[in-house]
């Protein structure tokens, strides 16, 4: 049974004389007169289990102490740790030609744990022990004892065991404490990567390679490796590991991002609060979730933080000038905490009789400088229809406005164009033509461009060329032209008119009247 | 196992000379150096000195000297103290004890069992 | 020459009982201190060396302490077997013995 006692990390204690209760019970050659176990007592009164010779007064003395088996243990070098005080010869009285002052040490590898007598020819000597000069003064109970300590290894080592052998030759002395221990590079986590307990090598010089093992929630970045020293030191760490997304290096290990923070990729930064507007209701967390209302676009960084869509536009102003409209607004009050804030025209023209009957303005209508996308705020909008109702929304859009489900960014305007002067009337038709009359119809302009007037018919006998002709005006869109010339050929031309002036006149119309008394109906434009 | 073995008693006159013999056993004689310790009748324990079985080399306490004379005859094991000029205040129990040196201290840790020597006209 | 005084010269004490016994050096002798048991008709007996060791075979309620010129015989519980003559003794360079302490029974 062996009490606790520490020793450095790097040391595995194979025996530890000192730690053993009882008695030590090794083997003395000779039996009686030679090495003898003795129990001291320590600075605290707990006994020591020491071996004493003193045979200093007859010379030629050869005392032999060998140790019980000591296991291997895997190691090839082995170091023993002797503490021993040593009496000075010239405190002996009357030994001066016989009296030692060092000892030998011997080791001797065997398979067989149980030896039982001491063969002095198979001891391979390890070294001659003398004290030192630098001695460690020692409380022994009440006696101050002048203890050494002198460390020696052996190596390389390869059969199951050993004992070491300790040969007195005349020397006044106490072995204190006898440790035996091998050297290994403690189990050590460098860069997160674990590296397990190593023995190290054979001889003084040797380093061993060891590859360690990721700890938990990391990965290699780079095969970690190090090399185990002689000494028990862990040298040249090559490579490394990183904790995984949702982890951070904390005391050598990695460790779940708290609640609140998170860690988005597999790197050597630490978890990072989430950012605004977001949060992680987990351990671990790899990105947050975003807060209500927000969102994250998708080309945003998990470090972003969460953004809103804009509010609407403020301040919009309208200014027509006949078919074209400038529009002038203000930024929204809120961005949604993004930059990349743009704006889109959604233009509706809308009925007179039923604003709420609207339809898309369709291709016609030309944005300057466009109708998507845009960064300034303001726009041109052309080829309007005259004296129409349009509806334009200004809508502000940024890189989260998609992941709205219920836009209200918009501010629209209600604006009618100006009037202006009708288009042509496409198509006119004789209705009746007789020998002295022609009733004329016609439809409306495709672009009224405003509340029609009054239509002018312009007609003319086709002979004349225009160098005599005559108006007729009516509100209606057809009228009878009486007083004409039987079996004679008439052009006829009508416009519109609005508040803002005339339009064109449509295409000529030959009519020729009739030479007998009957009707003739005609739907063309050009009646014979 | 380890003896002193001492003589019996001895009754001298004053002026005449004893040698008391320690026969030691069990142990290498010339390993350990003999010494010797006298005790008057109802008194304390009185060091006379010692002498180195290896060497014969004697070394003798503060009042005796002269007449006190330690001696070895190794071959028999066995160490002499030889008193001369006796008196009577030499009336005492002569013991021989094997002294022990160590690393933590000396003493003596194997006594014969005494001899008597009385001195009386 | 250097002196030992013990103290006290008679110590009466019953059997089971703690025992202390003192020896006071004229002049420091470090550690080098013996400590003697010597019963009626027989050779004194080695109980302590080099202050506190106590030799093989001797029982540990035996034990010892101190250094320079202060030392003290410790029984812890005294046995009947106990009862003697406790002499202390120096070995510089020259060796000298205390007068000795009676441990009688109460």
């Known amino acids: 049974v062996t009490g606790s006692r520490v020793y450095p990390a790097n040391e595995v204690t194979l025996l530890d004389s000192r730690s053993v209760q009882g008695e030590l019970g090794w083997i003395a050659s000779p039996l009686e007169g030679g090495w003898e176990e003795v129990s001291i007592m320590d600075e605290k009164n707990t006994p020591i289990r020491t071996y004493q010779v003193c045979n200093v007064m007859e010379p030629s003395q050869n005392n032999w102490l060998r140790t019980d088996w000591i296991t291997r243990e895997g190691a090839q070098r082995v170091y023993i740790e002797i503490k021993f005080t040593l009496r000075d010869c010239n405190s002996l009285p009357g030994v001066m030609g016989t009296c030692k002052e060092t000892f030998n040490l011997y080791y001797y590898e065997s398979d067989n744990d149980k030896e039982r007598f001491i063969r002095e020819n198979q001891f391979v000597k390890i070294d001659t022990i003398a004290a030192d000069e630098s001695f460690t003064q020692v409380d022994i109970g009440d006696r101050i004892m002048k203890l050494n300590t002198e460390i020696r290894d052996v190596g390389p080592l390869s059969k199951k065991g050993f004992y070491l052998a300790f040969q007195d030759v005349g020397a006044c002395i106490a072995l204190v404490s006898v440790r035996v221990f091998y050297k290994k590079c403690p189990l050590t986590v460098r860069n997160l990567a674990q590296f397990p307990d190593t023995i190290t090598g054979a001889d003084t010089s040797s380093l061993v390679e060891v590859r360690g093992s990721c700890v938990n929630n990391s990965e290699e970045k780079d095969v970690p490796k190090m090399y185990c020293g002689a000494d028990g030191e862990w040298l040249v760490p090559i490579g490394n590991c990183l904790c995984n997304a949702g982890h951070e290096e904390r005391s050598g290990e990695c460790q779940a991002c708290k609640i609140g923070y998170y860690k988005a990729l597999s790197t050597d930064a630490t978890c990072a609060k989430c950012p605004p507007h977001s949060y992680s209701v987990w351990e671990g967390a790899t990105s947050c979730t975003c807060d209500r209302g927000f969102f994250r676009a998708d080309n945003d960084a998990a470090s972003m933080p969460c953004t809103r869509p804009p509010s609407a536009p403020l301040n919009l102003i309208s200014n027509v000038n006949e078919t074209s409209v400038n529009l002038e607004w203000s930024s929204p009050q809120n961005t949604g905490g993004r930059q990349d804030i743009s704006y889109n025209v959604v233009c509706k023209k809308c009925g007179a009789g039923d604003p709420s009957k609207c339809r898309p303005c369709g291709s016609g209508v030309h944005y300057t400088p466009q109708q998507n996308g845009l960064k300034t705020t303001k726009v041109s909008i052309t080829d309007l229809l005259a004296h129409t109702n349009y509806t334009f929304e200004i809508w502000a859009v940024n890189g989260v406005s998609k992941y709205n489900p219920n836009p209200d960014q918009s501010v629209s305007v209600t604006v009618t164009t100006n009037q202006a002067a009708p288009s042509s009337i496409a198509l006119v038709q004789a209705k009746e033509v007789t020998r002295y009359s022609v009733a004329l119809a016609w439809l409306e302009p495709d672009r009224p461009n405003g509340v029609i007037l009054e239509y002018e018919v312009k007609y003319y006998e086709k002979d004349q060329n225009e160098r005599s002709y005559r108006i007729v005006r009516t509100a209606a869109r057809n009228t009878d032209i009486k007083g004409l010339n039987p079996l004679t050929s008439y052009v006829f031309h009508v416009r519109a008119r609005t508040a803002a002036g005339y339009g064109d006149f449509s295409e000529p119309l030959e009519v020729t009247t009739n030479t007998v008394p009957s009707r003739i109906i005609g739907d063309g434009a050009n009646s014979t | 196992q380890v003896q002193l073995l001492q003589s019996g008693a001895e009754v001298k006159k004053p002026g005449a000379s004893v040698k008391v013999p320690c026969k030691a056993s069990g142990y290498t004689f010339t390993s350990r150096a003999m010494s010797w310790v006298r005790q008057a009748p109802g008194q304390g324990l009185e060091w006379m000195g010692w002498i180195n079985t290896n060497t014969g080399n004697p070394t003798y306490a503060q009042g005796f000297t002269g007449r006190f004379v330690f001696s070895l005859d190794t071959s028999v094991s066995t160490a002499y103290l030889q008193i001369s000029s006796l008196k009577a205040e030499d009336t005492a129990v002569y013991y021989c004890a094997r002294v022990r040196f160590t690393v933590y201290g000396d003493g003596m840790d194997v006594w014969g069992q005494g001899t008597l020597v009385t001195v009386s006209s | 020459e250097i002196v030992l005084t013990q103290s006290p010269a008679t110590l009466s004490v019953s059997p089971g009982e703690r025992a202390t016994l003192s020896c006071r050096a004229s002049q420091s002798v470090s550690s080098n201190l013996a400590w003697y048991q010597q019963k009626p008709g027989q050779a004194p007996r080695l109980l302590i060396y080099?202050?506190?060791t106590r030799p093989t075979g001797i029982p540990d309620r035996f034990s010892a302490s101190g250094s320079g010129t202060d030392f003290t015989l410790t029984i812890s519980r005294v046995e009947p077997e106990d009862f003697a003559v406790y002499y202390c003794?120096?070995?510089?360079?020259?060796?000298?013995f205390g007068q000795g302490t009676k441990v009688e029974i109460k």
């Open positions: 003794q120096q070995y510089g360079p020259s060796w000298t």
């Open positions: 080099g202050a506190s």
